[in-house]
């Protein structure tokens, strides 16, 4: 009923942009997405007790506030502090796991190890993920033909703005000793360009956090090499020590296994290295 | 100079309702949040509601003051307004308003402060 | 409801004397440092001093200093000044943007 409440009180109507407004390279506006917006937030602030004050049609409203009726390709990280005011939540921040290009691996991780939290597990990251959003200038419309894709049209599109935006704050609030979870399948393991290459490492805070410890998830059954020798590994434990923060990695050879020992840590296969 | 200034205080009647202004000038007055905060007599500050209005209203409350009381903003004007229904006298107190920090790094905090009006219920 | 605890709630002190106040939170605040210092003398408004745990307000003197993490934290004047007698407070910051004060501490001249 609450969620009825909010949708009768929208004063926008969600129109279609005409098809002969501009194009953009990237997919439109996820389809129903006000709705899936304030129903993930409905959602999330009932499960979560510290966040069950937040005002739902308050989040929208500051959400659509960011992107509406804004030239999509000139976003900025300010249109976006009210929903990240709103969106404000205190995770305990040694119990943070960043993560980059293995988010499926991740996520499984933390609905195992429910301490422990990667963005998506925010209210803010649980709101956008895998969403996609863009309004016109001018107009009160949202976009559901074409969005701007980041790298054929513009960076500062409302969906790489948001991640970047919210990213930022959530490995500034980090501290003590930050996880990340890396894809040892990918060419460059660790990416400079990634968000966690270009945001997140550049906004941990040294007075907080005393390790980044890397964990390299392994992608062939019989792969026994070290990544954590890795030259762009090298490389990120360069850009962290520079930063005063202590760097560790970890090879996780078996993933399937890993996720497994973190269920029944007990079992006796547990012991050995994974 | 960055000045904020508050009126519409004074005495009502338990049950009553009072409007308070917040006049600002000497910033940008639409990319700040404007805070109400009230202190009762000889005691602590309690924060009531808070308000930013980039292009529209983005406001909330205190879970104490949801529904009692209203926040809202005259740009044209430069004003914030604080609506109080139903008035109890618990709510006597010295109703500030304060601008928050400006930028990531500094929200949640109050840099400019009125000087306070007084509310006796 | 989130609670800030200060203590003491009064403290008599001499010009030159060292001075620390503990301000304790019911819960973790914001980034484990989002918690600020202010300074009120009676009939004027709150004044900031230090914001992030640590970070000194501009214009404030360097004798303030904060510290703490998480739901403890300190504020210090390392030597007492005739201006300095106030009352102190101190505020974190919270979920969903919520703000809490402690109750304040009175700095008296002994």
């Known amino acids: 009923s609450g969620l009825n409440d909010i949708f009768e009180a929208q004063k926008i109507e969600w129109h279609e942009v005409p098809r002969w407004r501009q194009q953009w390279s990237g997919p439109g506006t996820t389809k129903r997405f006000p709705e899936t917006v304030l129903a993930r937030c409905v959602k999330y602030t009932e499960i979560h007790p510290e966040m069950r004050h937040v005002d739902c049609q308050s989040v929208w409203d500051a959400f659509k506030g960011a992107f509406i009726s804004k030239h999509p390709c000139n976003i900025t990280e300010e249109d976006y502090q009210p929903l990240m005011k709103l969106g404000t939540q205190t995770v305990p921040c040694n119990k943070i796991l960043l993560w980059s290009r293995i988010k499926d691996l991740a996520h499984q991780f933390t609905q195992v190890q429910r301490d422990m939290f990667t963005l998506e597990d925010t209210l803010l990251g649980y709101l956008a993920d895998d969403l996609t959003w863009c309004g016109e200038f001018n107009t009160s419309k949202i976009n559901y033909q074409s969005c701007p894709d980041w790298r054929k049209d513009c960076s500062n599109n409302p969906v790489s703005v948001f991640w970047k935006t919210v990213s930022r704050r959530f490995a500034e609030a980090a501290c003590d000793v930050v996880h990340v979870m890396l894809n040892g399948s990918r060419s460059k393991i660790f990416d400079k360009n990634s968000t966690f290459g270009s945001v997140e490492v550049h906004n941990l805070q040294p007075e907080k956090v005393q390790t980044l410890e890397a964990w390299v998830i392994h992608g062939g059954r019989e792969d026994s090499r070290d990544l954590c020798q890795d030259p762009t590994i090298k490389e990120l434990e360069s850009i962290i020590s520079k930063r005063n923060i202590q760097f560790s990695c970890k090879n996780i050879y078996r993933p399937d296994k890993f996720l497994q020992c973190v269920k029944n840590p007990e079992d006796s296969s547990c012991t050995s290295e994974i | 100079e960055v000045q904020l200034l508050e009126s519409g205080g004074g005495l009502v009647q338990p049950g009553g309702s009072l409007r308070l202004s917040c006049a600002a000038s000497g910033f940008s007055f639409n990319n700040y949040w404007i805070i109400w905060i009230r202190q009762a007599p000889g005691k602590g500050l309690e924060w009531v509601a808070a308000?930013?209005?980039?292009?529209?209203?983005?406001?909330y409350y205190a879970d104490w003051a949801k529904g009692r009381f209203t926040v809202s903003k005259d740009n044209s004007k430069n004003t914030v307004y604080l609506q109080m229904n139903s008035l109890r006298a618990e709510d006597t107190a010295v109703y500030y308003c304060a601008r928050e920090l400006s930028g990531a790094s500094y929200e949640g905090y109050f840099e400019s402060w009125g000087q306070g009006t007084l509310v006796t219920v | 409801d989130i609670q800030l605890t200060q203590s003491p709630s009064t403290l008599s002190a001499s010009v030159g004397d060292r001075v620390t106040i503990t301000c304790r939170s019911s819960?973790?605040?914001?980034?484990?440092?989002?918690l600020a210092w202010y300074q009120q003398k009676p009939g004027k408004a709150p004044k900031l001093l230090m914001y992030?745990?640590?970070n000194l307000a501009s214009g404030v003197p360097s004798r303030f200093s904060g510290s703490g993490s998480g739901t403890e934290f300190t504020l210090t004047i390392s030597s007492v000044q005739p201006d300095d007698f106030a009352t102190y407070y101190c505020q974190g910051y919270y979920s969903g943007g919520s703000y809490a004060f402690g109750g304040g501490t009175k700095v008296e001249i002994k």
């Open positions: 819960q973790s605040v914001y980034g484990h440092n989002w």
């Open positions: 308000i930013y209005s980039p292009s529209g209203d983005i406001k």
């Open positions: 992030r745990a640590s």
